[in-house]
Amino acid sequence: MMTGTIETTGNISAEKGGSIILQCHLSSTTAQVTQVNWEQQDQLLAICNADLGWHISPSFKDRVAPGPGLGLTLQSLTVNDTGEYFCIYHTYPDGTYTGRIFLEVLESSVAEHGARFQIP
């Protein structure tokens, strides 16, 4: 039975040209995390593997930085970066947990961070 929950940074907004940290945290399970994938819609941005370290997809290397921790930093944001981002935790023995973050990239300087929320 999957008992874990993923806490994410939730709905967030950031200014065009700025950067933002995408963070997820898996709790309430003793399952072992083997890998975390970061995806934007259907595109793989990055992988952090417990044994093999980080791999950033070549097409995102200039604008995506690993960390902090198992999180991901998006840099030089454009309005086109607006959308859904997913952290996918591969665990044993539970299986896969997915967290969702919605990022809105704003033209103005009125970028406010949304509240944290949980996805069971």
């Epitope: 995390v33 417990a50 044994d51 980080w54 930085a65 690993p66």
Partner: antibody
Framework: EVKLVESGPELVKPGASMKISCKAS????????MNWVKQSHGKNLEWIGL????????SYNQKFKGKATLTVDKSSSTAYMELLSLTSEDSAVYYC?????????????WGQGTLVTVSS | DIQMTQSPASLSASVGETVTITCRAS??????LAWYQQKQGKSPQLLVY???TLAEGVPSRFSGSGSGTQFSLKINSLQPEDFGSYYC?????????FGGGTKLEIK
């Protein structure tokens, strides 16, 4: 206390194969990946590859594919590296090494090293 | 593969002196860098990880710094036990690679 104890020095003939062992103690053997590192001429360090003792999964440095084969025996908490078709270039000290922790891919624990001399 | 270039290859210094060893990565490795010390005939020992975090039991005279592609290991007030070889290693993503080493000798 984490301990990695390797087998003793070996003198082998060119063309032969041989197996080095690394006995682990002081921690859960199946919970941590085992790495192997080659040190030539007492200087250059090269990562050979790793094995996950839990499932036997391996990842090799391209340079050592076909040269090294990594295996484990869970019942004795021992990792093995077989070196194939030995030449003088394979004369070196070989270390087993364990990561600090999951997602912490630096080598916190090392075996004492096994000196392999290839000579006719 | 990421290439790690260390300098100098060798260094002579006296007890009490301060020395700095540098390591350059062929591409951005952020702060994913470790330093090791190795004495003659012994295994490498972890000194620093994540570019600047001292491993357990490592004296505070050692310090690591840098990020991106340029890194350094500084040893203040050298002690007799500090002489030996030093290696950097990136821990960003496999294959892990090491610098060529710096041999620190007593002057």
């Amino acid at each position: 206390e984490v301990k990695l104890v390797e087998s003793g020095p070996e003198l082998v003939k060119p063309g032969a194969s041989m197996k080095i062992s690394c006995k682990a103690s002081g921690y859960s053997f199946t919970g941590y990946t085992m790495n192997w590192v080659k040190q030539s001429h007492g200087k250059n360090l090269e990562w050979i590859g790793l094995i996950n003792p839990y499932n036997g999964g391996t990842s090799y440095n391209q340079k050592f594919k076909g040269k090294a084969t990594l295996t484990v025996d869970k019942s004795s908490s021992t990792a093995y590296m077989e070196l194939l078709s030995l030449t003088s270039e394979d004369s070196a000290v070989y270390y087993c090494a364990r990561y600090a922790n999951r997602f912490e891919n630096w080598f916190a624990y090392w075996g004492q090293g096994t000196l392999v001399t290839v000579s006719s | 593969d990421i290439q790690m270039t260390q300098s100098p290859a060798s260094l002579s210094a006296s007890v009490g002196e301060t020395v700095t060893i540098t390591c350059r990565a062929s591409e951005n490795i952020y702060s994913y860098l470790a330093w090791y010390q190795q004495k003659q005939g012994k295994s490498p020992q972890l000194l620093v990880y994540n570019a600047k975090t001292l491993a357990e039991g490592v004296p505070s005279r050692f310090s690591g710094s840098g990020s991106g592609t340029q890194f350094s290991l500084k040893i203040n007030s050298l002690q007799p036990e500090d002489f030996g070889s030093y290696y950097c290693q990136h821990h960003y993503g496999t294959p892990w690679t090491f610098g060529g080493g710096t041999k620190l000798e007593i002057k």
